[in-house]
């Protein structure tokens, strides 16, 4: 029998400058694309190798963002998202939530689409 | 991990049409940007079009003969090729990365994606 999968979820503030090539990373979700079941929140999908999140360190594949600049991202279309992101300026500050995983018994699967990566 | 089978390809005359097909493992397919490229023997691979949560894009030389669409139920993404020329002839490779970037798209730099089919042979007669 598996063991139960409970997850830690904390907030963290990241500030990041906008690189050579932008932030660096990709996000899915908003209304029209729910990545997560009954969940419209925007996420992390892709951090690139080298760029800005990167070398940061601190944004991981998985976060949940919550905010851009103070600007709640609740309730926003995919590409709106998108867009908010584009035009953040050069500091940008991220509110996000970290989703960490804690193993209670034998080794789980995390599949795609689960919100922690 | 995300695997692409591309299939479709074959032998065709100049003039005529062919629809590629780009099937993906994974259940959020509907969040995936994807892309094809082409290489013929002995050049750089070549983009021919891209598919995003928002629009396509496609290379100048495919411009009014090629459609790039997807069908998200069937995790496919398709490729139809009309007034296929000779120089067409390419081995067709489907790309694809989950999410849109938040940075400006270049939906011809191949580093913009994370997995790579095997890829299917187009050739077309004169």
């Known amino acids: 029998m598996n063991g139960r999968v409970d997850y830690l979820v904390t907030e963290e503030e990241i500030n990041l400058t906008r690189g050579p090539s932008g932030l660096g990373f990709n996000i899915v979700g908003g209304t029209d694309q729910q990545y997560v079941s009954n969940d419209s929140g925007i996420y992390v999908s892709r951090i690139k190798e080298n760029g800005a999140a990167a070398l940061d360190g601190r944004l991981q594949e998985g976060d949940k963002i919550l905010s851009v600049n103070g600007q709640d991202l609740k309730n926003l279309l995919h590409q709106d998202a998108v867009d908010l992101f584009r035009n953040a300026g050069y500091a940008v500050s991220l509110r996000v939530q970290h989703r960490l995983q804690v193993q209670n018994g034998p080794i789980g699967h995390r599949g795609e689409g689960d919100p922690s990566g | 991990q995300v695997q692409l089978v591309e299939s479709g390809g074959g032998l065709v005359q100049a003039g005529g049409s062919l629809r590629l097909s780009c099937t993906a493992s994974?259940?959020?397919?509907?969040?995936?940007?994807m892309a094809w490229f082409r290489q013929a023997p002995g050049k750089e691979r070549e983009f021919v079009a891209a598919?995003?949560?928002?629009?396509?894009y496609y290379a100048d030389s495919v411009k009014g003969r090629f459609t790039i669409s997807r069908d998200n139920a069937k995790n496919t993404m398709y490729l139809q090729m009309n007034s296929l020329k000779p120089e067409d002839t390419a081995v067709y490779i489907c790309a694809a990365v989950i999410g849109s970037t938040v940075d400006s798209y270049s939906p011809s730099d191949p580093l913009e994606y994370d997995y790579w089919g095997q890829g299917t042979q187009v050739t077309v007669s004169s």
């Open positions: 994974g259940r959020t397919f509907s969040t995936y940007t």
């Open positions: 598919i995003t949560w928002s629009g396509t």
